[in-house]
Interface confidence: low
């Protein structure tokens, strides 16, 4: 008996050939002897099978002695032995239909689990192997699970189902919903405008949901909601915003926030969450703001930074074109009785300058100038 594997939703063509190369009487039946289709002269006739309008043939091939059974939009329950009766002979074809589906949705949040479920006909014992877009292979039986989805898992998953030494391949497109970056840090001098951007790592035709930016200022004892917004078909509308700071938000994607000016009291960490319609869970992106201030008070020149800096960052004060007068792995440095000239405050990481603020120290009888 010939075995043919089919995919749920696809079309399969079961062949039946007569020795005479001409159109003769034929019909296809299932294992219950219920007629599916046949011919009446040059007309196709249908029996009372549940295949209904999904069964067809190719009349153009009948004159060549070929009488295929075409089944469209295959269902698992179409798995059966199909019998072609032609010229007093019977040709039997066993059709096994498999389906492979993602647990709930093919759009999943980063960190969620992907479960692929194989639908198979009773009595079959298939094996499945799937290859992720990043080349990871997983094997299983009826279900295959991948926990903690990563951004790199977005793309086409190719799964091969093996049964009776025959195989059928499924391709499932998975979209991992996430921000492009899990975390970002912005370095600004006091008074500068701050731009926060939250680009998404996926594109969908319609994107609807709501979001919020919670902010934990370094100086504050608790976090505060700075802004809440809605997203409708990729259009952003602000619902509520604090008066201090008064953030501004772009109306289009990518999500874009503007802080009018960097101030020490705003330095800290924020968490932007985005809840998408019809999705459980939220997308998260952390954003950090580091603010630098250089001041001269009487005989003391001070440079300070606020916000989440790593212990390996170096803060330095130096006179322009000279060696650093002071360098420390701390958040404040100062120089007493600084010489007149242009002083630079530098925040650096392994020699790379992250943030720089200049302050002009005038001779002692003048007041300092901050460019």
């Amino acid at each position: 008996k010939k075995v043919v594997l089919g995919k749920k939703g696809d079309t399969v063509e079961l062949t039946c050939t007569a020795s005479q190369k001409k159109s003769i009487q034929f019909h296809w039946k299932n294992s219950n002897q219920i007629k599916i289709l046949g011919n009446q002269g040059s007309f196709l006739t249908k029996g009372p099978s549940k295949l209904n309008d999904r069964a067809d043939s190719r009349r153009s091939l009948w004159d060549q002695g070929n009488f295929p059974l075409i089944i469209k939009n295959l269902k698992i329950e179409d798995s059966d032995t199909y019998i072609c009766e032609v010229e007093d002979q019977k040709e039997e074809v066993q059709l096994l239909v498999f389906g492979l589906t993602a647990n709930s949705d093919t759009h999943l949040l980063q960190g969620q689990s992907l479960t692929l479920t194989l639908e198979s006909p009773p009595g079959s014992s298939p094996s499945v192997q799937c290859r992720s877009p990043r080349g990871k292979n997983i094997q299983g039986g009826k279900t295959l699970s991948v926990s903690q989805l990563e951004l790199q898992d977005s793309g086409t998953w190719t799964c091969t189902v093996l049964q009776n030494q025959k195989k059928v391949e499924f391709k499932i497109d998975i979209v991992v919903l996430a921000f492009q970056k899990a975390s970002s840090i912005v370095y600004k001098k006091e008074g500068e405008q701050v731009e926060f951007s939250f680009p998404l790592a996926f594109t969908v035709e319609k994107l609807t949901g709501s979001g919020e930016l919670w902010w934990q200022a370094e100086r504050a004892s608790s976090s505060k909601s700075w802004i809440t917004f809605d997203l409708k078909n990729k259009e952003v509308s602000v619902k509520r915003v604090t008066q201090d700071p008064k953030l501004q938000m772009g109306k289009k994607l990518p999500l874009h926030l503007t802080l009018p000016q960097a101030l020490p009291q705003y330095a800290g960490s924020g968490n932007l969450t985005l809840a998408l319609e019809a999705k459980t869970g939220k997308l998260h992106q952390e954003v950090n703001l580091v603010v630098m201030r250089a001041t001269q008070l009487q005989k003391n020149l001070t440079c300070e930074v606020w916000g989440p800096t790593s212990p390996k960052l170096m803060l330095s004060l130096k006179l322009e074109n000279k060696e650093a007068k002071v360098s420390k792995r701390e958040k404040a440095v100062w120089v007493l009785n600084p010489e007149a000239g242009m002083w630079q405050c530098l925040l650096s990481d392994s020699g790379q300058v992250l943030l720089e603020s200049n302050i002009k120290v005038l001779p002692t009888w003048s007041t300092p100038v901050q460019p």
Partner: antibody, heavy 118, light 111 residues
Framework: QVQLVQSGAEVKKPGASVKVSCKAS????????ISWVRQAPGQGLEWMGE????????YYNEKFKGRVTNTRDTSTSTVYMELSSLRSEDTAVYYC???????????WGQGTLVTVSS | DIVMTQSPDSLAVSLGERATINCKAS??????????MNWYQQKPGQPPKLLIY???NLESGVPQRFSGSGSGTDFTLTISSLQAEDVAVYYC?????????FGGGTKVEIK
């Protein structure tokens, strides 16, 4: 717009045959299944069978098998339903109806009253 | 064949009041997450008109006061606020298995 226009009322004697036509317009004729549904006076709706205008293949309700024949003429976008060996209980309004997805009937003809009386 | 049983046979409701019609199938009409149940309205001398398809989807152009619910074997058509033009006979119909079968109808009148 989609229209299904049926032939006029018929009076037949028991044992005779009747052939009702349904002319389709406003869409691709071969793309949708046409069903026949009948309704006896003061009664409910009963599906008789359907025809696939593309292939001409038909499927009938077991109750009417052997008595009903559906045909089509693609040149005039017309479907025909012939019911033979008429009896008095076949007196009904016969409707043609076009399916949407699956067997739900979105568009209907105006109906043809067939009266079987001796 | 799947037998469809509608209740009540007739229903008298005041204008602006809610009307509820029930339909029970002799076996489940669910398949692959959908319920293959449709509802029609028929006025005297007219062909039936499709109102609701796949249990709860409103056909284009049908007023929002009509809604459908249910799954498996038990289904309901609700008219939230009956209008004079809603006086008609309402039929349920399953479209899962051939032959498609209809309920016996429910006549809705104004009290």
């Amino acid at each position: 717009q989609v229209q299904l226009v049926q032939s006029g009322a018929e009076v037949k004697k028991p044992g005779a045959s009747v052939k009702v036509s349904c002319k389709a317009s406003g869409y691709t004729f071969t793309a949708y299944v046409i069903s026949w549904v009948r309704q006896a006076p003061g009664q409910g709706l009963e599906w008789m069978g359907e025809i696939y205008p593309g292939s001409g293949s038909s499927y009938y309700n077991e109750k009417f098998k052997g008595r009903v024949t559906n045909t089509r003429d693609t040149s005039t976008s017309t479907v025909y339903m012939e019911l033979s060996s008429l009896r008095s209980e076949d007196t009904a309004v016969y409707y043609c109806a076009r399916s949407g997805d699956g067997s739900r009937f979105v568009y209907w003809g105006q109906g043809t009253l067939v009266t079987v009386s001796s | 064949d799947i037998v469809m049983t509608q209740s009540p046979d007739s229903l008298a409701v005041s204008l602006g009041e809610r009307a509820t019609i029930n339909c029970k199938a002799s076996q489940s009409v669910d398949y692959d997450g959908d319920s293959y149940m449709n509802w029609y309205q028929q006025k005297p001398g007219q062909p039936p008109k499709l109102l609701i398809y796949v249990a709860s989807n409103l056909e284009s152009g049908v007023p929002q006061r009509f809604s459908g619910s249910g799954s498996g074997t038990d289904f309901t058509l609700t008219i939230s606020s009956l209008q004079a033009e809603d006086v008609a006979v309402y039929y349920c119909q399953q479209s899962l298995q051939d032959p498609p079968t209809f309920g016996g109808g429910t006549k809705v009148e104004i009290k």
